[in-house]
Amino acid sequence: SGTTNTVAAYNLTWKSTNFKTILEWEPKPVNQVYTVQISTKSGDWKSKCFYTTDTECDLTDEIVKDVKQTYLARVFSYPAGNVESTGSAGEPLYENSPEFTPYLETNLGQPTIQSFEQVGTKVNVTVEDERTLVRRNNTFLSLRDVFGKDLIYTLYYWKSSSSGKKTAKTNTNEFLIDVDKGENYCFSVQAVIPSRTVNRKSTDSPVECMGQEKGEFREI
């Protein structure tokens, strides 16, 4: 058989952050190539990454068509230089991925504090609304556009001079918090989707502290 040295892919894994979605698998190919197919539960298979020697395939363009659908992918193995060859059952070797629902499973990317502004004893902290690769009407949607009120942010803030952290939450991209006059504060934010069962939280944003150039201070 022409497939004697062909092995099926294994360890198929979805890697997805803010809907940028890549399927990874093993092994590194030796005398073989791969083609990936993706489908929704009720849809037709679409081929991607034809006859590649890579062990990953970017499927973002497919999943962003409807991030609430559940997707299944499969990786076909072919002998290098003889991609028409089939296995003993009359079709190429392939392995199925786990199911993947982008809306429920994509990792939330590390957020960024866009700005903070102090007015007297109030500080307004704004989180950047990151653009995703999800499109509608030829425009890219932001994370907030996609998740709406399902997405909240948690703010951690503390006096520069102490380690005791306070928290605040918002279902928008802005916080308005009370601070002590004359004190400098540091801030970090985390994206959270409370309704999820997996991948509920992002990593924390980089810390930003008052007295640095990102913020603005106004004495009233």
Epitope: D66, Q69, R136, L141, D145, T172
Partner: antibody
């Protein structure tokens, strides 16, 4: 073709229940929300409520005790029920698609509307 | 409850005029920007013009533009065309789960 279309009786007797159906085509209710909006003759638009792409419902506080929106009766349809109707509920009723899929107020596809008269 | 107040209620203008309609919210709209503008002609369904405060909806002429944030928003028609005489509504989502609201409308009529 992406469209929504309202249907239901044009006359309802008080204090009965107004029941309308919105048939959608060309898009998935698992990805887009649907809102109901009404317009009394010669007056402005009033938001009734929304069912989002996750099936959660949101209602105008002034109508909340009387309104139910659901999409579990048939595939690709959203229903509106408004109970204990009075003449003040006489209006053109519209269903419309929510562009973002949640209760965002951005309604990009509208039905032609159906006039419901409440009268005995 | 979220309340949206449009001004003016009626606006008389001529073809070629620059027209501005204001929408004020009783409290900040959701994430300061989820406000939409609609055009409605008699006997017809409303048509989405602008969403997310400033994004032009598909197929809408570029003479329409939107701006604003938080509680104050404007719809501008840079050069009024005969087809633009209609009633305009703003609509917004609010941070609380329940509320979406429409403004009372602004009728743009021929001077």
């Amino acid at each position: 073709q992406v469209q929504v279309q309202e249907s239901g009786p044009g006359l309802v007797k008080p204090p009965g229940t107004l029941s309308l159906t919105c048939a959608v085509s060309g898009f998935s209710l698992s990805y887009y929300g649907v809102s109901w909006v009404r317009q009394p003759p010669g007056k402005g638009l009033e938001w009734i409520g929304t069912i989002d792409s996750s099936g959660r419902t949101y209602y105008n506080p002034s109508l909340k005790s009387r309104v139910t929106i659901s999409n579990d009766n048939a595939p690709n349809t959203v229903s509106l029920k408004l109970s204990s109707v009075t003449a003040a509920d006489t209006a053109v009723y519209y269903c419309a698609r929510d562009f973002y899929g949640w209760n965002s107020g951005a309604l990009d596809i509208w039905g032609q509307g159906t006039l419901v008269t409440v009268s005995s | 409850d979220l309340q949206l107040t449009q001004s003016p209620s009626t606006l008389s203008a001529s073809v070629g005029d620059r027209v501005t309609i204001t929408c004020r919210a009783s409290q900040s709209v959701y994430s300061n920007k989820y406000l939409s503008w609609y055009q409605q002609k008699p006997g017809k369904a409303p048509k989405l013009l602008i969403y997310k405060a400033s994004t032009l909806a598909s197929g809408v002429p570029s003479r329409f533009s939107g701006s604003g944030s938080g509680t104050e928003f404007t719809l501008t028609i840079s050069s009024l065309q005969p087809d633009d005489f209609a009633t305009y509504y703003c609509a917004a989502a609010y941070s609380d789960d329940s509320d979406t609201a429409f403004g009372q409308g602004t009728k743009v009529e021929i001077k």
